[in-house]
Interface confidence: medium
C-alpha cells in the first residue's frame, strides 16, 4: 500500500513470486534516496495495470532484472 509519511517508501510488503517478463507493462527501479533509504522495484503488470512491489534480494527477481535488461540491450541500436 502506498503510504504518505516522512519516510516515503512505497512498499509495506514485497513479493518473491516470479514475474513473467511478457506480462510486464513497466518495471521501475527506484534507487535509494533521502526519502527512502533502500531500492524499490515496482512492476506494473499488463493485466489491469496492477502494481507489485518486488524483492530486490530475491533470486527470481534478480533473474527478471537480467532478462529485462537483456531484452532492452537487444532492442537498442
Amino acid at each position: 500500500i502506498p503510504l504518505s509519511r516522512t519516510v516515503r517508501c512505497t512498499c509495506i510488503s514485497i513479493s518473491n513470486q516470479p514475474v513473467n517478463p511478457r506480462s510486464l507493462e513497466k518495471l521501475e527501479i527506484i534507487p535509494p534516496s533521502q526519502f527512502c533509504p533502500h531500492v524499490e522495484i515496482i512492476a506494473t503488470m499488463k493485466k489491469k495495470g496492477e502494481k507489485r512491489c518486488l524483492n530486490p534480494e530475491s533470486k527470481a527477481i534478480k533473474n527478471l532484472l537480467k532478462a529485462v535488461s537483456k531484452e532492452r540491450s537487444k532492442r537498442s541500436p
Partner: antibody, heavy 124, light 109 residues
Framework: QVQLVESGGGVVQPGRSLRLSCAAS????????MHWVRQAPGKGLEWVAV????????GYADSVKGRFTISRDNSKNTLYLQMNSLRAEDTAVYYC?????????????????WGQGTTVTVSS | EIVLTQSPGTLSLSPGERATLSCRAS???????LAWYQQKPGQAPRLLIY???SRATGIPDRFSGSGSGTDFTLTISRLEPEDFAVYYC??????????FGPGTKVDIK
Amino acid sequence: QVQLVESGGGVVQPGRSLRLSCAASGFTFSEYGMHWVRQAPGKGLEWVAVIGFAGLIKGYADSVKGRFTISRDNSKNTLYLQMNSLRAEDTAVYYCAREGAGSNIYYYYGMDVWGQGTTVTVSS
Amino acid sequence: EIVLTQSPGTLSLSPGERATLSCRASQSVSSSYLAWYQQKPGQAPRLLIYGASSRATGIPDRFSGSGSGTDFTLTISRLEPEDFAVYYCQQYGSSPIFTFGPGTKVDIK
C-alpha cells in the same frame, strides 16, 4: 506452518513500561508488513501500529502515538512493541498480525495471520 | 479520520438462515481497502474478506462481501453452527490508519 507467537504481557503499574514480542515462523518474515492490534476486555478490535517489511514505514493509532514504538528484527524473525507511559485504558489482549500476502500496492489484503495474543493489565 | 459503523449490533438468527451485516463509512472508502473478520470467544480474529469482495484462503463460499463508497455488506448465505461469532469490518486509510468497526454479534435465536 505459518505461526505468530506473542509474549511479554503481564501486570504493570500506570506510568511504567513493557515490551511485547512476536516471534514469527513458517514464512519469510522480512517480506511482510506487520501489525499490532489490541482488544480491551469485552470490547472490539483496535488497530495499534503497523511497520513495513524493512522497518522504515511505521504508523500508529492516535491513542498510542508518542507512547508506543513498533520495531522489528528481521534477523531474529521478531516483531516488537515498546509501550511506555502505560495507562489503565491500555489494558487489553495484544495481537500481532501479518499484512496479507497480496502484491498489488494499490490494494489492502487484510491481516491474514494472527497470533493468539498476550494480555497486558495496567493497574495500581 | 474515517469512522466505521456496523449494524445491527446483534443479529439473532437460526442455523440455515441468511445473515446480512452492514458496514457504513463516514466518508467514501475505496473498495480495494475494505476487509471483514470473524472472531469467536477466546480466539484471535480470522480474515474472511479483503478488497470488499475477495474471499481469503480457506473461507467457505457461503461468505460473500459486496459494496462500494460508504456502504459495504457481508452476507452469510446459510448460517452454519460454527458461524455464530462477532464480525468486524476494517478499512485502510492513508497516514496510515487501519480502522475497525465496532462489530456485529451473530447469535443463535
